[in-house]
């Protein structure tokens, strides 16, 4: 499961960047097409990747026809803030710059692979680390909590910084930071468990910087389908990095004969990547690819950004829905392998586990299924949304809602199937997770549509914070608590060990249904919130005197 834990954050950060920037780019193209007349030109937009006003917006999950919008007095055309000689005017980029941007995206994607490789290398050797430090389960829980909490707290901070300061410097510093911390943590003496806890917290901070900021840079480097491709590559790095992390952890541990060496691989690669980011990633302006970079000067305070986001109903409801996904994935990832092991004990196809880790084989199968459904879910969701957009403007949240509600059914069926068939349970897990993960890219699209460019990093960060806080930060413990509560009132037997955990896990489909409801609520406000965001972008493109955000 873990390989997908933060994918929504990365997808959100990446994909949400795309549509608004697309609109900005088209607007600037329209300005350039006006040929310096000082008004909004009627001619087609000039330059690659730039389309005219009423054209369709290319996003990761397809394209949607945009209703023509513009400031008063220019119906049917985008806002036009500058003449061809004004601050928005740019010359077409030479091909070499295209290659440079490709290299930059590749480096950022590699960084994302390393980000997750590092996280799951630690996950891969966690049992060894626990054994070495004499960590009890409550201590392991503390390690998990400290990581998630520090990630949660740091994300909004980096969101704020990412909307205001040099992103590639913050990014590189973040990579250097977590690399140094991870490398140092491989030398922590056995008696200093608290240092291990501190190091996990610090790594959470470092990784929060990457997850929050990197996608927004990619969003500002590319246009249209190219950006779609680059963003896809960027967040497909998550399951890839996670899988490589487990592989790296176990193989380096075996080769070196000491688990400590596993923690020294990703930091070395991280330092190299951090340096490459500094060298190869251009210091793009926000909205650069849309050729609005110089015009997006309007800066609002963090408090104002937060107020605007909290008032944005589509954003709030989709964030709550994302929390429901996070709740379910966190709980299922933690407990499903053990639940399936207990199911096999009840079916007498496995022995009671007295020496943990229990259900190691089930963990492996579940991990593989989760990683694959991560890929499949994104593709399915994107395809379904592309098709549904031909039918309705509310396609994005509606596809998410259907995916969630369908997922809830199959998650419920896991507990029915597990009693008699483990294979059946795995099939239900496969379908349930595919549907659950199908809303990743779309949720990102929703955020991108309804949030203006200058507060996107903050929006991604706040969504990441919320989804961890209400989702996977507490769900594994809540399920464990409910299971123990049920078990206390029943007789001690393998059957009740299995049933109590199953009953506790039944909370997940209910939360997923709740998430589906939140997506339906998003659908109610989506069109109006998207229109409002477009109007604000148009205002941002005006000369400073007329800007009101």
């Amino acid at each position: 499961m873990m390989c997908l834990e933060c994918a929504s954050a990365a997808a959100g950060g990446a994909e949400e960047e795309e549509a608004d920037a697309e609109r900005r780019r088209r607007r600037r193209g329209a300005q350039r097409g006006a040929g310096g007349s000082g008004c909004c030109g009627a001619r087609g937009a000039g330059g690659a990747g730039v389309s005219a006003a009423g054209d369709e917006v290319q996003t990761l999950s397809g394209s949607v026809r945009r209703a023509p919008t513009g400031p008063p007095g220019t119906p049917g055309t985008p806002g036009c803030a500058a003449t061809a000689k004004g601050p928005g005017a740019q010359q077409p980029k030479p091909a070499s710059l295209g290659r440079g941007r490709g290299a930059a995206a590749a480096i950022l994607s590699l960084g994302n692979v390393l980000n997750y490789l590092d996280r799951y290398t630690v996950a891969g050797v966690l049992l060894d680390a626990q054994q070495h430090f004499g960590v009890k389960d409550r201590g392991a829980g503390l390690l998990q909590s400290v990581f998630i909490c520090s990630f949660m707290v740091a994300a909004p901070i980096f969101g704020y910084l990412g909307d205001r300061f040099n992103r590639k410097v913050i990014l590189s510093c973040g990579i250097f930071f977590w690399s140094a911390v991870t490398f140092s943590s491989s030398f922590i003496p056995q008696q200093y468990f608290w240092l291990l806890v501190l190091s996990r917290g610090l790594v959470g901070i470092g990784e929060a910087s990457y997850s929050t900021i990197a996608p927004t840079i990619i969003g500002d480097l590319f246009t249209k389908n190219t950006r779609t491709l680059m963003l896809s590559v960027f967040y497909f790095a998550i399951p890839l990095g996670s899988g490589l992390g487990y592989i790296t952890g176990s193989s380096v541990k075996q080769a070196a004969g000491d688990w400590h060496w596993a923690l020294r691989v990703s930091p070395v690669l991280g330092m190299i990547t951090g340096t490459l980011i500094l060298i190869l990633v251009p210091a793009t302006k926000r909205g650069h690819a849309d050729q609005l970079g110089d015009q997006l000067k309007a800066r609002t305070s963090w408090l104002r950004d937060m107020k605007a986001l909290i008032r944005n109903r589509s954003y709030v409801f989709s964030s709550l829905a994302t929390s429901a996904v996070s709740f379910a994935t966190g709980a299922l990832g933690m407990w499903i392998p053990l639940y399936l092991h207990r199911a096999q004990v009840v079916q007498k196809t496995a022995e009671t586990c007295n020496s943990p880790p229990c259900g190691a084989k089930d963990s492996l199968i579940f991990g593989a299924i989760t990683c694959f459904t991560g890929f499949l879910g994104v593709v399915t969701g994107a395809g379904a949304t592309r098709w549904c957009r031909l039918k309705t403007q509310r396609a994005d949240p509606l596809v998410c809602a259907v995916g969630m509600l369908g997922s809830a059914i199959f998650i419920c069926l896991i507990f029915v199937a597990a009693k008699s068939s483990i294979v059946g349970a795995y099939i239900c897990i496969f379908v349930g997770e595919t549907l659950l993960f199908s809303n990743w890219a779309i949720t990102a699209d929703i955020l991108m549509y309804v949030v203006i460019p200058t507060r996107r990093a903050t929006a991604v960060a706040l969504q990441s914070f919320t989804s961890h806080l209400l989702g996977d930060a507490g769900s594994p413990y809540l399920i464990g608590f409910i299971s123990d509560l049920i078990r206390q009132s029943t007789k001690d037997s393998p059957l009740w060990e299995f049933l109590s955990l199953g009953y506790a896990l039944m909370l997940c489909p209910f939360v997923v249904v709740l998430g589906g409801m939140f997506f339906l609520a998003t659908a109610l406000f989506f069109v109006s919130d998207r229109a409002r965001a477009e109007q604000q972008v148009n205002q941002l493109a005006m000369p400073p005197a007329s800007v009101k955000v």
Epitope: G134, K136, Q190, S355
Partner: antibody, heavy 125, light 107 residues
């Protein structure tokens, strides 16, 4: 005051079984990891088995020389730790010490901060 | 398994002298070494934990040092009650192992 008192030792024949018991007091037993360490006559110390607390699923670890023959267990309600010894061999003859690992709530030290007085187990035909 | 070697096996000293007992590990074990004292017909007792950390109730004349593979237990001005066997133990990885011991005897 921390106290560890071992009982159950004696003279047994090779191949037979014996169960050692260690009664504890003076500390929160349920949170503490416990081990058995033995010492053959005139020889050095040898760690035998370790049992973790309930918060660590009472996971047990064993020395290779006794794996599959000895079983460590605990009863938190009685604050006792046990060592069930099956298929005893001549080389199992030793003084068996019940030991406590220092506890730090979130983690535990693998060293032994308190030792019992020891109980003699003699395996001979 | 990590093998611990203690030297010398026996050390003869006169009371009031200062001594150093050595413990060498077969591989690097950071500071995961602990020292025990076992007097004749008694149970062992913990003297030093994690190579150099002192234990409450243990006289300050006992001190430890070292990291990696080489460790030292130092006794500053040996007293009569110190004549006993000293064991080092590693906790870097399971199985937990002890050194063969160093016997400190009166010269």
């Amino acid at each position: 005051e921390v106290q560890l008192v071992e009982t159950g030792g004696g003279l047994v024949r090779p191949g037979s079984s014996l169960k050692l018991s260690c009664a504890t007091s003076g500390f929160t037993f349920s949170d503490t990891w416990m081990s058995w360490v033995r010492q053959a006559p005139g020889k050095g110390l040898e760690w035998v088995a370790l049992i973790k607390d309930k918060n660590s699923n009472s996971e047990a670890n064993y020395a290779e020389s006794i794996k599959g023959r000895f079983t460590i267990s605990r009863d938190d309600s009685k604050s006792r730790v046990y060592l069930q010894m099956n298929t005893l061999r001549d080389q199992d003859t030793a003084t068996y010490y019940c030991t406590r690992h220092e506890d730090f709530y979130y983690y535990s030290g693998y060293y032994f901060d308190y030792w019992g007085q020891g109980v003699m187990v003699t395996v001979s035909s | 398994d990590i093998v611990l070697t203690q030297s010398p096996p026996t050390l003869s000293v006169t009371p009031g002298e200062s001594v150093s007992l050595s413990c060498r590990a077969s591989q690097g074990i950071s500071t995961s070494i602990h020292w025990y004292q076992q007097r004749s017909n008694e149970s062992p007792r913990l003297l030093i934990k994690y190579a150099s950390q002192s234990i409450a109730g243990i006289p300050s004349r006992f001190s430890g040092s070292g990291s990696g593979t080489d460790f030292i237990l130092s006794i500053n001005r040996v007293e009569s009650e110190d004549f006993s066997v000293y064991y080092c133990q590693q906790t870097y990885s399971l199985p937990l192992t002890f050194g063969p011991g160093t016997k400190l005897e009166v010269k």
